[in-house]
């Protein structure tokens, strides 16, 4: 229903704490360079204004849209042009164009320093002094680095963060309590970020229909006992929630997500038998829990998919009458039977089925034409299955770091023009798929691997879009979202690439590498590996292994030496010479 004052409505629905958190996230995602203090001041002003509207919905400006209110706040920031350049031009526009303009200026790779975690004692002190400000800083720092982070889910991670600090800051050994727990939250949050970015990309590039198809497949896998009408309702609601969050309408998004969680918990009987544990939790935990709830047990008596979609004499008539609905029922029926497939694969199968009907239903004898469609799915299913087997075997043989290096070599050969930092980041993320998915039971591997890889490759595409350098990457990124992963997997060595000339300084290291944390050391070594491949794109695995082993040995020796600087300056040039010889 329509409300006199949208801001009062949202404040009442969400409560002050969540309202303030979401407004802070919104501002931090739009203006990514502003300090916490600048945003906190705006948030307080907006909150005070919301309270006046709660008291009197007819008060001045209370009837304005949230975009108008928030946009006016952002545009009133001093020195906007100096700090944000052409983003300031958005402020010359009227709504809704102004908000669209802000969205277009969101930066997926802002030049901000990595979010460093303070040491335990300092963290606990500032948390105890002012928990609200501490959590505000967390929301601000994550939101500005991840401008499409799913806002209600970020509130959930902040809550997790809060609980960990409350618990660990009371312990004697704060460090060993905090580190593994916060690392766990960080890892989950980073995965959540790339997954949500993929959803927003789907929405932005291909519209609501594409996202809704994704939602139907995913929900059908999770809730195989729910009927098609129920799945359609959930998919429609979920699409609305995600559209709002991707569009910067964070208050509406969080409010609608809470409504959806409420609906699911009130209708467990027609959705799934696995929801009760989630539904017993408080709001943020409940919604999070529902988003990753285990699959319900599949009905035992499901008929073969062929009955309705191949053998039925009315396939073409039914398809012609309501194409999207007929394809939706196909996707639903196929997905509920295959929790062991990735959503990307299910969407590829639905696309193949659609193309087959489009072709066959226009012919003289459609059944003869589409009769073999299910058999034609086989190669589409085998390809990702083989990908999972090959890559998990390799991961088990090499471990995470070695697996990352193998992927780094492979992707540098596919797209050597891409910047080394982007290649290293991508390979490290792609390589984590092993740890994340290869240890799972067989029937969970494929959905885990492929849907995770698709999300990481979406980030590669977003970064490449900013500065396109590789025709290979452009080709894979400009196709449909579900075809990206197979496209990248099929890429081979880029024959058009002119190898980089060998620069000794690229492979010159100093003693400061010895004191770096293990992760940073790995990144340095992986940077060198990518540069080696750019110098010799056709180097064999054996050649590269020889060089990298030599490099590791050199670091180990010099970092243990009494006079590290001398060791690096004398042994370094020798290492460079040996590398050149090994790759000659």
């Amino acid at each position: 229903e329509a409300h006199k004052s949208e801001i009062a409505h949202r404040y009442n629905d969400l409560g002050e704490q969540h309202f303030k958190g979401l407004v802070l996230i919104a501002f931090s995602q739009y203006l990514q360079k502003c300090s916490y203090d600048e945003h906190a001041k705006l948030v307080q002003e907006v909150t005070d204004f919301a309270k006046t509207c709660v008291a009197d919905e007819s008060a001045a400006n209370c009837d304005k849209s949230l975009h108008t209110l928030f946009g006016d706040k952002l545009c009133a920031i001093p020195n906007l042009r100096e700090n944000y350049g052409e983003l300031a031009d958005c402020c010359t526009k009227q709504e809704p164009e102004r908000n669209e303009c802000f969205l277009q200026h969101k930066d997926d790779n802002p030049s901000l320093p990595p979010f460093e975690r303070p040491e335990a004692e300092a963290m606990c002190t500032s948390f105890k002094e002012n928990p609200t400000t501490f959590m505000g800083h967390y929301l601000h720092e994550v939101a500005r680095r991840h401008p499409y982070f799913y806002a209600p889910e970020l509130l959930y991670y902040a809550e997790q963060y809060n609980e960990i600090l409350t618990q660990c800051c009371a312990e004697a050994d704060k460090e060993s309590c905090l580190t593994p727990k916060l690392d766990g939250v960080k890892e989950k949050a980073l995965v959540s970020s790339v997954r949500q970015r993929m959803k927003c990309s789907s929405m932005q590039k291909f519209g609501e229909r594409a996202f809704k198809a994704w939602a139907v497949a995913r929900l059908s896998q999770t809730f195989p006992n729910a009927d098609f009408a129920e799945i359609t309702k959930l998919a429609t609601d979920l699409t609305k929630v995600n559209k709002e969050c991707c569009h910067g309408d964070l208050l509406e998004c969080a409010d609608d997500r809470a409504e959806l969680a409420k609906y699911m918990c009130e209708n467990q009987a027609t959705i799934s038998s696995k929801l009760q544990t989630c539904c017993d939790k408080p709001l943020l935990k409940k919604a999070h829990c529902l988003s990753e709830v285990e699959h319900d047990t599949m009905p035992a008596d499901l008929p073969a998919i062929a009955a309705d979609f191949v053998e039925d004499q009315e396939v073409c008539k039914n398809y012609a009458e309501a194409k999207d609905v007929f394809l939706g029922t196909f996707l639903y029926e196929y997905s509920r039977r295959h929790p062991d497939y990735s959503v990307s694969l299910l969407l590829r199968l639905a696309k193949k089925y659609e193309a087959t009907l489009e072709k066959c239903c226009a012919e003289a004898n459609p059944p003869a034409c589409y009769g073999t469609v299910l058999a034609e799915f086989q190669p589409l299913v085998e390809e990702p299955k083989n990908l999972v087997k090959t890559n998990c075997d390799l991961y088990e043989k090499l471990g995470e770091y070695g697996f990352q290096n193998a992927i780094l070599v492979r992707y540098t050969q596919k797209a050597p023009q891409v910047s080394t930092p982007t290649l290293v980041e991508a390979a490290r993320n792609l390589g984590r798929v092993g740890t994340k998915c290869c240890t799972l039971p067989e029937d969970q591997r494929l959905p885990c691997v492929e849907d995770y890889l698709s999300a990481i490759l979406n980030r590669v595409c977003l970064l490449h879009e900013k500065t396109p350098v590789s025709e290979h990457v452009t080709k894979c990124c400009s196709g449909s979202l579900v075809e990206r992963r197979p496209c990248f997997s099929a890429l081979t060595v880029d024959e058009t690439y002119v190898p980089k000339e060998f620069k000794a300084e690229t492979f010159t290291f100093h003693s400061d590498i010895c004191t770096l944390p293990e992760k940073e050391k790995q990144i340095k070594k992986q940077t060198a590996l990518a540069e080696l491949v750019k110098h010799k794109p056709k180097a064999t695995a054996e050649q590269l292994k020889t060089v990298m082993d030599d490099f590791a040995q050199f670091l180990d020796t010099c970092c243990k030496a009494a006079d590290k600087d001398t060791c690096f300056s004398t042994e370094g040039p020798n290492l460079v010479t040996r590398c050149k010889d090994a790759l000659a």
Epitope: A322, K323, E358
Partner: nanobody, 123 residues
Framework: QVQLQESGGGLVQPGGSLRLSCAAS????????MVWVRQATGKGLEWVST????????RYADSVNGRFTISRDNAENTLYLLMNSLKPEDTAVYYC????????????????RGQGTQVTVSS
């Protein structure tokens, strides 16, 4: 809201022809499949013909195949049914229809329908 208005019905002798039209509004006609169904006195709805959004897929009931032709003009938001070699058993009220969200495909009682146009084939 969805509106469908049939016209073109009338009394015709066996072997004669009629062309029915259906003017559509209130929905995305050019992306919707369309259907002709008919209902003889005292009988249920009978499916006659279906045409896809882009006219590439066309289907007819066996009883009318070879005699009736369905077509559409997406620029004019109009659906047509050309009926040749009419027989007395074609006598019925003819409705144009389109899928209604939430209904089952092929469950024509639940589709959006117009008021219908009467076709009577008699000598």
């Amino acid at each position: 809201q969805v509106q469908l208005q049939e016209s073109g019905g009338g009394l015709v002798q066996p072997g004669g022809s009629l062309r029915l039209s259906c003017a559509a509004s209130g929905f995305a006609f050019s992306t919707s499949g369309m259907v002709w169904v008919r209902q003889a006195t005292g009988k249920g709805l009978e499916w006659v013909s279906t045409i896809s959004d882009d006219s590439r897929i066309i289907r007819y009931a066996d009883s009318v195949n070879g005699r009736f032709t369905i077509s559409r003009d997406n620029a004019e938001n109009t659906l047509y049914l050309l009926m040749n070699s009419l027989k007395p058993e074609d006598t019925a009220v003819y409705y144009c229809a389109t899928y209604r969200a939430g209904s089952r495909i092929g469950s024509y009682e639940d589709y959006y329908r117009g008021q219908g146009t009467q076709v009577t084939v008699s000598s």
